[in-house]
């Protein structure tokens, strides 16, 4: 038995889980997902029994071999999977686990603006990054640009402090998780304090 | 010094394959996203495809996505092209990329390897 | 496919002359546009993204501007070390693509 072995995957990808064994006379391998049994094979009657009817077109074995090929993932298909290899010339069956994530592609994140203030001609807020549907495990980075700046900023808020006269600058969000990136439409200082230039002291959402 | 470099272009006949490397140093490979691009003699840049950092998400250009695998091998530092079916309008030069910063433009471009499929 | 079709294909000017190369994206791409410069029998070098963010040590005599489908690269001051082709890049969507190149000599 080896150690843990993590994969990744996206929606609607592929997955291999990848089997090497040197167990000479195979009697029999089963796959299992989170405890429940998910492919036997018998190596010997070149049998294949795939126990749930709804996996049967997403698992393959690819090149003859016996790593399990897991394809259309879903976001549910994410767990802990399990290869027993059972042999009559073992005293115990050699096992492997590994533990998969499957994350979902990452579409343009959004942009809410937090309280806003703008005193002595500064205009000062905050912007929210988030996903619309709260994917998991998703790192924001913030872009500032501008003639007088190219700066990152790591989190989902981005602390703004922008005062009138100065060159315009632009904030991009964007998001990454481990299998897709996207940015968000870009936001325009000027365009974003307009709103408060009028009253010098006013807050707004 | 960050680097990237090509390897194994050639001569190939239509309908032959070939597989290119690209060995990269000087940063962290296993971190970033990568990209194969091809130059035409004489024409424009045409970007081919990118894959991720554990090798989950691989894009490519629809009208090569059939023809052209993309892999890595992070422990290698390397990133490959498998090109199959190979035509004559597949003559050019091969770069691979890296994106600066992991975001959508590349600042690291390899030497590039010239690959040419004549009879 | 989003098209990026650049003007003119090739020009000619003078030294100290301002140029401009323009770019339309076939489609809305925001500001995800970054410009490249390819000397002649060299590789791709990166010069601006986000449509108008220069690349570190790129000269300042190079800067970019738009957004949506309409953007420009001009070079100030052409200097006798800027001959080369200018290409265009969207990567506002896939597949990322590139212009056709603008080819720029010196009179």
């Known amino acids: 038995s080896g150690p843990v072995k993590e994969l990744v995957g996206s929606v609607g990808g592929a997955v291999t889980f990848p089997l090497k064994s040197k167990v000479k006379q195979v009697d029999s391998i089963v796959w299992t997902f989170n405890t429940t049994p998910l492919v036997t094979i018998q190596p010997e009657g070149g049998t294949i029994i795939v126990t749930q009817n709804r996996n049967r077109e997403r698992v393959d074995f690819p090149d003859g071999g016996y790593s399990l090929k897991l394809s259309k993932l879903k976001k549910n298909d994410s767990g802990i999977y399990y290869v027993g290899i059972y042999s009559s010339s073992l005293q115990q069956p050699s096992t492997q686990e590994y533990v998969l994530h499957v994350y979902e592609h990452l579409s343009k994140p959004k942009v809410t603006m937090g309280l806003q203030s703008n005193k002595n001609g500064t205009c000062v807020t905050n912007l929210t990054c988030c996903m619309e549907h709260g994917e998991e495990d998703v790192i924001y980075t913030w872009k500032a640009l501008g003639q007088a700046a190219n700066e990152s900023h790591n989190g989902s808020i981005l602390p703004i402090s922008w005062r009138w006269g100065e060159s315009d600058m632009t904030f991009i969000c964007v998001a990454r998780n481990p299998v897709s990136r996207n940015f968000s439409s870009p936001i325009l200082a000027r365009k974003l304090c307009e709103g408060a230039a009028d009253d010098p002291d006013s807050s707004m959402v | 010094e960050v680097q990237l470099v090509e390897s194994g272009g050639g001569l190939v006949q239509p309908g032959g394959s070939l597989r290119l490397s690209c060995a990269a140093s000087g940063f962290d490979f296993s971190r970033y996203w990568m990209s194969w691009v091809r130059q035409a003699p004489g024409k424009g840049l045409e970007w081919i495809g990118e894959i991720n950092p554990d090798s989950s998400t691989i894009n490519y250009a629809p009208s090569l996505k059939d023809k052209f695998i993309i892999s890595r091998d992070n422990a290698k530092n390397s990133l490959y092209l498998q090109m199959n079916s190979l035509r004559a309008e597949d003559t050019a030069v091969y770069y691979c990329?890296?994106?600066?910063?992991?975001?959508?433009?590349?600042?690291?471009w390899g030497q590039g390897t010239l690959v040419t499929v004549s009879s | 496919d989003i098209q990026m079709t650049q003007s003119p294909s090739s020009l000619s000017a003078s030294v100290g002359d301002r140029v401009t190369i323009t770019c339309k994206a076939s489609q809305d791409v925001g500001i995800a546009v970054a410009w490249y410069q390819q000397k002649p029998g060299k590789v791709p070098k990166l010069l601006i993204y986000w449509a108008s963010t220069r690349h570190t040590g790129v000269p300042d005599r190079f800067s970019g501007s738009g957004s949506g489908t309409d953007f420009t690269l001009t070079i100030s001051s052409l200097q006798p070390e800027d001959v080369a082709t200018y290409y265009c890049?969207?990567?506002?969507?896939?597949?990322?693509?590139f212009g056709q190149g603008t080819k720029v000599e010196i009179k």
């Open positions: 890049q969207q990567y506002s969507s896939y597949p990322y693509t």
């Open positions: 990329a890296r994106p600066d910063g992991n975001y959508w433009y590349f600042d690291v």
